[in-house]
Interface confidence: low
């Protein structure tokens, strides 16, 4: 003896990404010799049994048996969202509802606000915006592998009244380590299923130079050729170098090359040498104390850096 519920159809709610395909499945245990029917939120019949009722090539029959009617809707649009109804024309008519939710895919984010010629310790503010998400997406910021804490995501409804534009800004103080770094804005949304959708902005930071003096060979001896390399770093890279020998007043200016060359070392070359590396961001002076060793093969490391 069948209970009344055996003639009650059942279905399920579905979520689909815009542009994707959704399958609506309706089942019934006892069909009482009646056919199942699917209709859309506008109450237009889509299929009655295996008979197509609406001319829409996106809608196809998947399964039609006395106990099941399944249809697919491809290339789903935001306008397809709503309650779909499965009906069976028993006495009385019984219905089941399937709520179809269409997710709007956020567009690739756009970063604005980058100003070139940032200097060390300047404050940078970047803005990020992504349109087309439904529900509203969330934006996150990172610098390399480090998360940046931006403003909370702001949400604005798009003109279509269905999707949203989200925006966020981040402000941070730049350091010399940030020169060449990529600031990344990522959009997080269920429609992306974990896929990365992000935009990066590479930043350039101008900073004062540093320098160090490197001897070649490391342990110079009398009679050897010696090169003192003044290795400058900075942005921009130092273009101007000035070598001086300390101890004389004024200091003896020797060369404006980045390397100071001693073709044949003498004891008299011993002393403290300074290299000033200059860019348009400033100058930096490195020192090196040269102690010219005897020409014997005994290892020594009396040359010192400062």
């Amino acid at each position: 003896n069948l209970s009344q519920d055996d003639s009650q159809p059942w279905t399920s709610d579905e979520t689909v990404v815009a542009g994707g395909t959704v399958v609506l499945k309706c089942q019934v245990k006892d069909h009482e010799d009646s056919s199942l029917q699917w209709s859309n939120p506008a109450q237009q019949t889509l299929y009655f049994g295996e008979k197509r009722a609406l001319r829409d090539n996106r809608i196809q029959l998947v399964t039609s048996t006395p106990h099941e009617l399944s249809i697919s809707i491809s290339n789903v649009a935001l306008a397809d969202e709503g309650e779909y109804t499965c009906s069976i024309f028993t006495m009385p008519v019984r219905t089941a509802k399937s709520l179809v939710t269409v997710l709007g895919i956020p567009q690739k984010p756009i970063i604005t606000g980058y100003k070139s010629s940032l200097r060390e310790k300047d404050t940078a503010t970047l803005n990020c915006q992504s349109s087309g998400s439904k529900p509203a997406a969330r934006l996150t910021w990172r610098k390399g592998d480090q998360e940046l804490h931006g403003e909370p995501t702001r949400i604005q409804e798009d003109p279509n009244g269905k999707t949203f534009t989200v925006s966020s800004s981040v402000t941070f103080q730049v350091t010399r380590e940030d020169d060449g770094a990529s600031i990344v804005c990522s959009v997080n949304h269920e429609s992306l299923k974990g896929a990365d959708r992000s935009t990066s902005q590479r930043i350039e930071v101008l900073y004062t130079p540093t320098a160090m003096i490197r001897p070649d060979p490391p342990h110079p001896r009398e009679g050897q050729k010696l090169l003192l390399h003044c290795e400058g770093r900075g942005n921009p890279v130092p273009q101007q170098y000035l070598w001086e020998k300390e101890g004389s007043v004024p200091p003896l200016k020797m060369t404006q090359e980045s390397a100071l060359i001693f073709p044949f070392l003498n004891k008299s070359d011993s002393g403290t040498y300074g290299c000033t590396a200059t860019s348009n961001m400033g100058s930096y002076k490195a020192y090196y104390t040269l102690n010219v060793n005897d020409p014997s093969p005994v290892p020594s490391s009396s040359s010192t850096y400062h």
Epitope: T210, M212, R233, A286, S301, Y305
Partner: nanobody
Framework: QVQLVQSGGGLVQPGGSLRLSCAAS????????RGWFRQAPGKEREFVAA????????NYADSAKGRFTISRDNSKNTLYLQMNSLRAEDTAVYYC?????????????????WGQGTLVTVSS
Amino acid sequence: QVQLVQSGGGLVQPGGSLRLSCAASGRTFSNYARGWFRQAPGKEREFVAAIDYSGGSTNYADSAKGRFTISRDNSKNTLYLQMNSLRAEDTAVYYCAAPASRRPSWDADGYDYWGQGTLVTVSS
């Protein structure tokens, strides 16, 4: 003369963490800069990170920024490299190094003393 003795390498899964240590003996440790370098199989030795004599200034390779932290404890004459979010491409022999200078260098040629190296393998 400075002797540098390393410890702390090993096998770690991707995403894991390791801490390398480098104990120095000999010349006063605190007066000089220190650095970490690494050498992957078949590749040249490359700069990872450096720290100045006071610990107040650090410098990192792009590949290490945000994931690795260099630090030093002058009271223990020890240099450290904390490595987080490790990736397969971090697999290498890691070396600590000391230049005969107070300034950190980014060039292997600027370092006079080297540790024995410790193997870090990142694999699942």
